[in-house]
């Protein structure tokens, strides 16, 4: 059988309601193996931006081969939620599922995909599709990491000292400076899982007149620059 191929393709599109949609169903060279009774579990780490739609998929097995399709959803601080479809009786059943934004894409006898409408921080967690066949189970799991774009600000607060802040990002952003200065970085963790990173830098060298703060984040990178004035200057602010 084909060997696992770990390259993952993130498909993004716009839906009619203008909300970006992500699907990590793709990887046609996915995980196959010699078919023994114990079938490999495939797990994917998947970063997805907050406020987008996400679609999660099961292994590629036709409905005619299946007995039960189950989605198991484990979110932090909540009991495990399961959504199950039994082919024989054409019944769906839910246990401990309270989030109405997590649903089957359509009728499970037509499409076994799971969708999350308007991803929120609370959707961080583990999602697993279990396909029960007469000869064993096929699994596909997703460690969903919700990404929150930080708000970036840059300002001068003292003579030849600048402060760059990446506010409420998830995960924490990384801040670097050009040119390098004498810097101190602090991180502040919020209860919702976001992190504010604050980097304060001082430049003694007087031939440095303009400095650039570069913020790196999984949702994208942002650079802001400021002229070092003898007194505090204008405040710069931007979203990534």
């Amino acid at each position: 059988a084909a060997q696992p191929n770990n390259s993952l393709m993130l498909q993004t599109s716009k839906e009619n309601h203008a909300l970006a949609s992500s699907s990590l169903c793709m990887d046609e060279k996915q995980i196959t193996q010699n078919y023994s009774k114990v079938l490999a579990e495939v797990n994917t780490s998947w970063p997805v931006k907050m406020a987008t739609n996400a679609v999660l998929c099961c292994p590629p097995i036709a409905l005619r081969n299946l007995i039960i399709i189950t989605w198991e959803i484990i979110l932090r601080g909540q009991p495990s939620c399961t959504k199950a479809y039994k082919k024989e009786t054409n019944e769906t059943k839910e246990t401990n599922c309270t989030d109405e934004r997590i649903t089957w894409v359509s009728r499970p006898d037509q499409n076994s995909d799971l969708q999350i409408r308007t991803v929120a921080i609370t959707h961080d967690g583990y999602y697993r599709c279990i396909m029960v066949t007469p000869d064993g189970n096929f699994h596909r799991g997703y460690h969903l990491q919700v990404l929150v774009t930080p708000e970036v600000t840059l300002f001068q607060n003292r003579n030849r000292t600048a402060v760059c802040k990446a506010v409420a990002g998830k995960p924490a952003a990384h801040i670097s400076w050009i040119p390098e200065g004498d810097c101190a970085t602090k991180q502040e963790y919020w209860s919702n899982g976001t992190v504010t990173v604050k980097s304060t830098c001082h430049w003694e060298v007087h031939n440095v007149s303009t400095v650039t703060c570069h913020v790196s984040h999984l949702t994208g990178n942002k650079s802001l620059y400021i002229e070092l004035l003898p007194v505090p200057g204008a405040k710069k602010s931007a979203k990534l």
Partner: antibody, heavy 119, light 110 residues
Framework: QVQLVQSGAEVKKPGASVKVSCKAS????????MHWVRQAPGQGLEWMGY????????NYNEKFKGRVTMTRDTSTSTVYMELSSLRSEDTAVYYC????????????WGQGTLVTVSS | DIVLTQSPASLAVSPGQRATITCRAS??????????MHWYQQKPGQPPKLLIY???NLESGVPARFSGSGSGTDFTLTINPVEANDTANYYC????????FGQGTKVEIK
């Protein structure tokens, strides 16, 4: 190893029926869907339908509905394909093929059974 | 039903060259990120043999000279380089729900 062994060649008169068997071995018979395909002389492959030995589900190509019946015997790990009201254009090699789960691909085929319909 | 159209109907290739066969579906055979398109090789007097599954996965034991690509409605089987024993008929097949085959492509080695 997985093996699908089909019954021998048949010669039938128009209007008659033929029943072709496909005996499976080397795996759990009830676990895998079995398809039937035919191939007329010098022609391409034509899907006829499938039977799921696990629950006896069948699904037939619209073209053969009313004329084809697929059955299974779990005690002998055998599936059968019966085609009735035979006509000359049913002369073909008939194959059984096992569907693998992942990707619904057909990794194992029977050797084929030639059915000749002639008056 | 989904109709699969293969082209060309026949193909003559010299050993060492590349052979390309295309298969076009009347509607998409891709769903949930997977393309339920497979390629089979059939030699005279033999049942078909699986070469490629899910559009681009090489079946175990099949030489790497065979490759598949495509998604949605357009798919390609490539044999590169072609060898003398590749003379055969090649069929595309989709297997999502109701199943169909392409009409076949006859590959001959010059």
């Amino acid at each position: 190893q997985v093996q699908l062994v089909q019954s021998g060649a048949e010669v039938k008169k128009p209007g008659a029926s033929v029943k072709v068997s496909c005996k499976a071995s080397g795996y759990t018979f009830t676990s895998y869907v079995m398809h039937w395909v035919r191939q007329a002389p010098g022609q391409g492959l034509e899907w006829m339908g499938y039977i799921n030995p696990y629950n006896d589900d069948t699904n037939y190509n619209e073209k053969f509905k009313g004329r084809v019946t697929m059955t299974r015997d779990t005690s002998t790990s055998t599936v059968y394909m019966e085609l009735s009201s035979l006509r000359s254009e049913d002369t073909a090699v008939y194959y059984c093929a096992r569907e693998d789960y992942y990707g619904s691909r057909w990794g194992y085929w029977g050797q084929g059974t030639l059915v000749t319909v002639s008056s | 039903d989904i109709v699969l159209t293969q082209s060309p109907a026949s193909l003559a290739v010299s050993p060492g060259q590349r052979a390309t066969i295309t298969c076009r579906a009347s509607k998409s055979v891709s769903t949930s990120g997977y393309s339920y398109m497979h390629w089979y090789q059939q030699k005279p007097g033999q049942p078909p043999k699986l070469l490629i599954y899910l559009a681009s996965n090489l079946e175990s034991g099949v030489p790497a000279r065979f490759s598949g690509s495509g998604s949605g409605t357009d798919f390609t089987l490539t044999i590169n380089p072609v060898e003398a024993n590749d003379t055969a008929n090649y069929y595309c097949q989709h297997s999502r729900e109701l199943l169909t085959f392409g009409q076949g492509t006859k590959v001959e080695i010059k």
